[in-house]
């Protein structure tokens, strides 16, 4: 860029040391240097302003996006806490239902045992009743009475 | 820095107002000022360019990081939704199992009641049968028939 | 700004081409231009430094915020994994409890069937016993024996 040119031409100003006056060419070299520097600075100012504005714009977009992301993260954190509570309640409920099932199972097991006992009792009752029925004399026909009648008659 | 030096030495240029010509020393002072300003500007340009480059680099890293973090957040949000659905299904299932258990319990309770009734009936049957057996005349030995036989004989 | 003024006045330096010397006014114009440029550069340096400092400040806060948000996101991700594991265990447990309930239900159903059978048996036993009791001769008063006694007497 114009700025990066070294104005080393200034070192050769007025090679005639005896002269007390400035040469017009020297002044023109100076004026040209000043003009170049001015333009260089103008370009740089313009370019730098633009770049800094771009940076601020980008930073502002980041700022907004960052804020939104922070909100979203906080929201997720909240929902996750809620989910954790729900899961805990579910675990508790699940445990209750499991205990309920175990209790039911225990009740059922004892009921099964009692049912077996009841079945045995009923079976025994049936046998008893069967024996009783088989050994039961027919009311109008007692064999002893019949034989006695025959004997008496 | 060189930039911050105030070029106030210019104010003392050519103290001889009558002279229409510029003194070489004055021009050399000017040339020196211009040289210093040029160097100062060159340094500042160099430094500013470096800083702006650093900033843009940092911004690019932020950009990438931000994008990744946003993706991660969206991913977490999605997984959280999925987890929410799973948890909801679990709640429904848990409710179903709980209702199933309650229904089972209700069935079991009524079965227990019926079992008690059945036990009572069986007990009553046993008592009846026991009475019947105890009161049953031994078929070959009716006491009346025996006494009658004796009487007749 | 001072920088944006174009130093076009330099073009009219020393209209007398024959003169080999520099006019004091020309040098003063140059000196003034140099002074203005110096001040302009000083202002711009100051302003740019301030803006770049602001940007770096913003970037540092972002850096910190970004780091914290990343940590928070990682934390949420971890907790979410943990929650996922817990939910999976819950699903397994829920399935177990469901199977337990189904098994219980199956046991209960078969128990209900056996209870119905048992009820039928008990009912049949009751009927049998009722019949037996109704048809049972009163031990001290067999009608045949009574009639036989009468006959014999």
């Amino acid at each position: 860029s114009r700025i990066d040119q070294d104005n080393s031409s200034f070192d050769s100003l007025s090679p005639e040391p005896k002269s007390r006056f400035a040469m017009l060419d020297d002044v023109k070299i100076l004026a040209n240097g000043l003009l170049q520097l001015g333009h260089g600075l103008k370009d740089f100012v313009h370019k730098t302003k633009g770049q800094i504005n771009d940076i601020f714009q980008k930073l502002n977009i980041f700022d907004q996006s960052f804020y939104d992301l922070s909100l979203q993260t906080s929201e997720i954190k909240e929902e996750e806490k809620e989910l954790r509570r729900t899961t805990y309640k579910l675990q508790v409920k699940n445990e209750e239902v499991k205990n309920m099932s175990l209790e039911l199972n225990s009740k059922l097991e004892s009921l099964l045992e009692e049912k077996i006992l009841l079945q045995q009792k009923v079976k025994y009752l049936e046998e008893q009743l069967t024996n009783l029925i088989q050994n039961q004399p027919e009311t109008p026909e007692h064999p002893e009475v019949t034989s006695l009648k025959t004997f008496v008659e | 820095s060189r930039i911050d030096q105030d070029n106030s030495s210019f104010d003392s240029l050519s103290p001889e107002p009558k002279s229409r010509f510029a003194m070489l020393d004055d021009v050399k002072i000017l040339a020196n000022g211009l040289l210093q300003l040029g160097h100062g500007l060159k340094d500042f340009v160099h430094k500013t360019k470096g800083q702006i480059n650093d900033i843009f680099q940092k911004l690019n890293i932020f950009d990438q990081s931000f994008y990744d973090l946003s993706l991660q957040t969206s991913e977490i949000k999605e997984e959280e939704k999925e987890l929410r659905r799973t948890t909801y299904k679990l709640q429904v299932k848990n409710e179903e199992v709980k209702n199933m258990s309650l229904e089972l319990n209700s069935k079991l309770e009524s079965l227990l009641e019926e079992k008690i009734l059945l036990q009572q009936k069986v007990k009553y049957l046993e008592e009846q049968l026991t009475n019947l057996i105890q009161n049953q005349p031994e078929t070959p030995e009716h006491p009346e028939v025996t006494s009658l036989k004796t009487f007749v004989e | 700004s001072r920088i944006d003024q174009d130093n076009s006045s330099f073009d009219s330096l020393s209209p007398e081409p024959k003169s080999r010397f520099a006019m004091l006014d020309d040098v003063k114009i140059l000196a003034n231009g140099l002074l203005q440029l110096g001040h302009g550069l000083k202002d711009f340096v100051h302003k740019t430094k301030g803006q770049i400092n602001d940007i770096f400040q913003k970037l540092n806060i972002f850096d910190q915020s970004f780091y914290d948000l990343s940590l928070q996101t990682s934390e949420i991700k971890e907790e979410e994994k943990e929650l996922r594991r817990t939910t999976y265990k819950l699903q397994v447990k829920n399935e177990e409890v469901k199977n337990m309930s189904l098994e219980l239900n199956s046991k209960l159903e078969s128990l209900l069937e056996e209870k119905i059978l048992l009820q039928q048996k008990v009912k049949y036993l009751e009927e049998q016993l009722t019949n037996l009791i109704q048809n049972q001769p009163e031990t001290p008063e067999h009608p045949e024996v009574t009639s036989l006694k009468t006959f014999v007497e």
Partner: antibody, heavy 120, light 107 residues
Framework: EVQLVQSGGGVVQPGRSLRLSCAAS????????MHWVRQAPGKGLEWVAV????????YYADSVKGRFTISRDNSKNTLYLQMNSLRAEDTAVYYC?????????????WGQGTLVTVSS | DIQLTQSPSFLSASVGDRVTITCWAS??????LAWYQQKPGKAPKLLIY???TLQSGVPSRFSGSGSGTEFTLTISSLQPVDFATYYC?????????FGGGTKVEIK
């Protein structure tokens, strides 16, 4: 040099309105979020409201929500606070302040403050 | 909302003393805390932001530390210009909140 010059304070009756202004210079106004903070006599600082760079996003303290409106005119480098339905408890010195970044608001430059007295 | 509690409310000290002010947050705010100095009739002035970064132009005798819920502002050697009221402010989330303030007086 960053400067925030405030105006618009004064004595006002309860239920009436007032508009505060804050003129900014020495920085690119549109690049910064701006806040209003107040301080009741002898009390601590209380944040009132914020407006983001572009003027689109605004947030308020619960105590002023629905009554106060923050706004900005980037072309005029000016920040405003429109205060309606004023109450005695709104009596305070009101400060405008610039922040470094708005998602993590650090207030690096403040105005000189303007006193608002709500009294009948 | 995040509450900030400052301790002590008043502090009497002499020039050259080491002074420590504490600020507690009602919930974790990472390092998002700023410290301000306010002199009577003047606007607050930013001293420290994100817990420990010194604002440009602030003397190095001021320092900040802490993270999470407990933060401290330390003045290593109190100077006559340091007699003022100090406020902490959380910059973690809106609404912004300030501590109640700590008034540092000459003993």
């Amino acid at each position: 040099e960053v400067q925030l010059v405030q105006s618009g304070g004064g004595v006002v009756q309860p239920g009436r309105s007032l508009r505060l202004s804050c003129a900014a210079s020495g920085f690119t106004f549109s690049n910064y979020g701006m806040h209003w903070v107040r301080q009741a006599p002898g009390k601590g600082l209380e944040w009132v409201a914020v407006v983001w760079y572009d003027g689109d996003n605004k947030y308020y303290a619960d105590s002023v929500k629905g009554r106060f409106t923050i706004s900005r005119d980037n072309s005029k480098n000016t920040l405003y606070l429109q205060m309606n339905s004023l109450r005695a408890e709104d009596t305070a010195v009101y400060y405008c302040a610039r922040d470094i970044i708005t998602s993590r608001p650090t207030l690096d430059y403040w105005g000189q403050g303007t006193l608002v007295t709500v009294s009948s | 909302d995040i509450q900030l509690t400052q301790s002590p409310s008043f502090l009497s000290a002499s020039v050259g003393d080491r002074v420590t002010i504490t600020c507690w947050a009602s919930q974790g705010i990472n390092s998002y805390l700023a410290w301000y100095q306010q002199k009577p009739g003047k606007a607050p002035k930013l001293l420290i932001y994100p817990a420990s970064t010194l604002q440009s132009g602030v003397p190095s005798r001021f320092s900040g530390s802490g993270s999470g819920t407990e933060f401290t502002l330390t003045i290593s050697s109190l100077q006559p210009v340091d007699f003022a009221t100090y406020y902490c402010q959380q910059l973690n989330s809106y609404p912004l909140t300030f501590g109640g303030g700590t008034k540092v007086e000459i003993k």
